[in-house]
C-alpha cells in the first residue's frame, strides 16, 4: 500500500519520515499519531496499537501537537501589578501583561518576569523618551525657555509663555507669569515640538496609557540600592 493510506501505527519505509501529525516512536519503531493541542499521551503506541490521548486536566495545557505524558502547568495567577490578557485553557498558558503605568523590566519567553512602575519625571524635567511595554521613561532637564511643573511619566517640557511684560520670569519648573496684558505662546529654542494640550492644573494623577500587549508575569522591582535616575522620582 502507498504510505498515504497506511493507518497508524505503521513502519515507515527506510529513509522516509512519518506523515503529518505523526511521530516516530523509537521503542515501537513505528509511526504513531500525535495528540492534538489540549491533549497529552495517556498511553504510548506499540507495534499494534496507536497512541491513546487524553484531555489536559484543569490548570494544565499543551499548545502544540505532542506526545508528552503530562500536560504543562499553567503559570501562577497574575500579580497585582498585572492584567490577565490570556486565560489558562487546555490549549494555552495564562498570559499576564503589565498594567498601565508599568513596563516589563525583565522578559521571559511568553510574558514578563518582572514589571516595574514607569519612572515619573519631576518638576524641571520632561519626558525625553516615552515608556514602552519593555522600556522605562527617560527624563531630561528642561532646556532654557521650557518648563515642566508636574511629576509625570508622560509630560514633556513645554515652552514658556512669552509676555509683553514679565511679572515673574519662568524657569525649568515654572512657567513665566505675565502682567495683565494677554500673553502669547512661543516655541522657544530647545522646546519639544510636539502637540501638547495646555492644562491649568498640575497633573499628579497616574497616567493611563494604552494597555501593554507584551505578555508578562511579574513582581515589583525592588527600588534597590541604586539611586533613581536624574530627574525622576521613586514615588
Amino acid at each position: 500500500l502507498p504510505a498515504q493510506v497506511a493507518f497508524t501505527p505503521y513502519a515507515p519505509e527506510p529513509g522516509s519520515t512519518c506523515r503529518l501529525r505523526e511521530y516516530y516512536d523509537q521503542t515501537a519503531q513505528m509511526c504513531c499519531s500525535k495528540c492534538s493541542p489540549g491533549q497529552h499521551a495517556k498511553v504510548f503506541c506499540t507495534k499494534t496499537s496507536d497512541t491513546v490521548c487524553d484531555s489536559c486536566e484543569d490548570s494544565t495545557y499543551t499548545q502544540l501537537w505532542n506526545w508528552v505524558p503530562e500536560c504543562l502547568s499553567c503559570g501562577s495567577r497574575c500579580s497585582s501589578d498585572q492584567v490577565e490578557t490570556q486565560a489558562c485553557t487546555r490549549e494555552q498558558n495564562r498570559i499576564c501583561t503589565c498594567r498601565p503605568g508599568w513596563y516589563c523590566a525583565l522578559s521571559k519567553q511568553e510574558g514578563c518576569r518582572l514589571c516595574a512602575p514607569l519612572r515619573k519625571c519631576r518638576p524641571g524635567f520632561g519626558v525625553a523618551r516615552p515608556g514602552t511595554e519593555t522600556s522605562d521613561v527617560v527624563c531630561k532637564p528642561c532646556a532654557p525657555g521650557t518648563f515642566s511643573n508636574t511629576t509625570s511619566s508622560t509630560d514633556i517640557c513645554r515652552p514658556h509663555q512669552i509676555c509683553n511684560v514679565v511679572a515673574i520670569p519662568g524657569n525649568a519648573s515654572m512657567d513665566a507669569v505675565c502682567t495683565s496684558t494677554s500673553p502669547t505662546r512661543s516655541m522657544a529654542p530647545g522646546a519639544v515640538h510636539l502637540p501638547q494640550p495646555v492644562s491649568t492644573r498640575s497633573q499628579h494623577t497616574q497616567p493611563t496609557p494604552e494597555p501593554s500587549t507584551a505578555p508578562s508575569t511579574s513582581f515589583l522591582l525592588p527600588m534597590g540600592p541604586s539611586p533613581p535616575a536624574e530627574g525622576s522620582t521613586g514615588d
Epitope: A3, Q4, P12, G15, S16, T17, R19, L20, R21, K34, L64, W65
Partner: antibody
Framework: QVQLVQSGAEVKKPGASVKVSCKAS????????INWVRQAPGQGLEWIGW????????QFNENFKGRVTMTTDTSTSTAYMELRSLRSDDTAVYYC????????????WGQGTTVTVSS | DIQMTPSTSSLSASVGDRVTITCRAS??????LNWYQQKPGKAVKLLIY???KLHSGVPSRFSGSGSGTDFTLTISSLQPEDFATYYC?????????FGGGTKLELK
C-alpha cells in the same frame, strides 16, 4: 531574519538532471522540514516533497517518486533538490519552503529558481 | 489526491473594498486550510494557517473562515499592496495540494 536563498536559473536539455540549492539562515536548520514546491508557467503550485535535515529522511509526492532526490548539508545549512530525466513539462520555477508538519503549511519561502527544459 | 478549487481565477476590486476569496476542497479537510499571497518577483508569503490563525506579521485586515470543504479568505479593507494572487492549500493529507490561485486586480 529567517531566510531561504536559492541558486540561480538553469537551462537543461530533455533527459538531463538539475540540482537546485537552498541556503537557510536565521533559524536552527535541522529542526524544520525543507519542502520543495514548483510552479509551471501560468500554473498553480505543486508540492514535490520534504526532507527533514536532522536525519535526512524524506516524504515525496508519488508523482515525483523515483525521479527526485533531496539531500541536505547541515554544516552549511543548505538543502538540495535534484530532478532527473527532465522533460519539457518540468519547466517551472522551483521553490524551497520551510514547513510545519503539524498544520501542513509553509511559513518561509525561497525566491525561486527558474528551470527551463528545452532542446 | 485532494483537489482544491478557487471559486474564481480572477477578481476585480478597489482600494477600501471588503473582498472575499473562496476555496473548495474535494473532501473534508477539517480546519487544515492555509492561505498564501504571491506577487510577481517576490517570495510567496503565508497569510493564514489552520483556517483562521493569522501568521505573525500579517495585517489584521486578513482573516479566514469556513470548515470541512468550503473556506473563505477575507480582506476587510483592501490596500494597494494587497493586489496579488492568492492560493489556498490543504494541510490535511499527503500529498499537500494547492488551489489554482485567484488573481486580485484593480478595478
Amino acid at each position: 531574519q529567517v531566510q531561504l536563498v536559492q541558486s540561480g536559473a538553469e537551462v537543461k536539455k530533455p533527459g538531463a538532471s538539475v540540482k537546485v540549492s537552498c541556503k537557510a539562515s536565521g533559524y536552527t536548520f535541522i529542526t524544520y522540514d525543507i519542502n520543495w514546491v514548483r510552479q509551471a508557467p501560468g500554473q498553480g503550485l505543486e508540492w514535490i516533497g520534504w526532507i527533514y535535515p536532522r536525519d535526512g529522511n524524506t516524504q515525496f509526492n508519488e508523482n515525483f517518486k523515483g525521479r527526485v532526490t533531496m539531500t541536505t548539508d547541515t554544516s552549511t545549512s543548505t538543502a538540495y533538490m535534484e530532478l532527473r530525466s527532465l522533460r519539457s513539462d518540468d519547466t517551472a520555477v522551483y521553490y524551497c519552503a520551510r514547513g510545519d508538519r503539524d498544520y501542513g503549511y509553509f511559513d518561509v519561502w525561497g525566491q525561486g529558481t527558474t528551470v527551463t527544459v528545452s532542446s | 489526491d485532494i483537489q482544491m478549487t478557487p471559486s474564481t481565477s480572477s477578481l476585480s476590486a478597489s482600494v477600501g473594498d471588503r473582498v472575499t476569496i473562496t476555496c473548495r476542497a474535494s473532501q473534508d479537510i477539517s480546519n487544515y486550510l492555509n492561505w498564501y499571497q504571491q506577487k510577481p518577483g517576490k517570495a510567496v508569503k503565508l497569510l493564514i494557517y489552520f483556517k483562521s490563525k493569522l501568521h505573525s506579521g500579517v495585517p489584521s485586515r486578513f482573516s479566514g473562515s469556513g470548515s470541512g470543504t468550503d473556506f473563505t479568505l477575507t480582506i476587510s479593507s483592501l490596500q494597494p499592496e494587497d493586489f496579488a494572487t492568492y492560493y489556498c492549500q490543504q494541510g490535511n493529507t499527503l500529498p499537500l495540494t494547492f488551489g489554482g490561485g485567484t488573481k486580485l486586480e484593480l478595478k
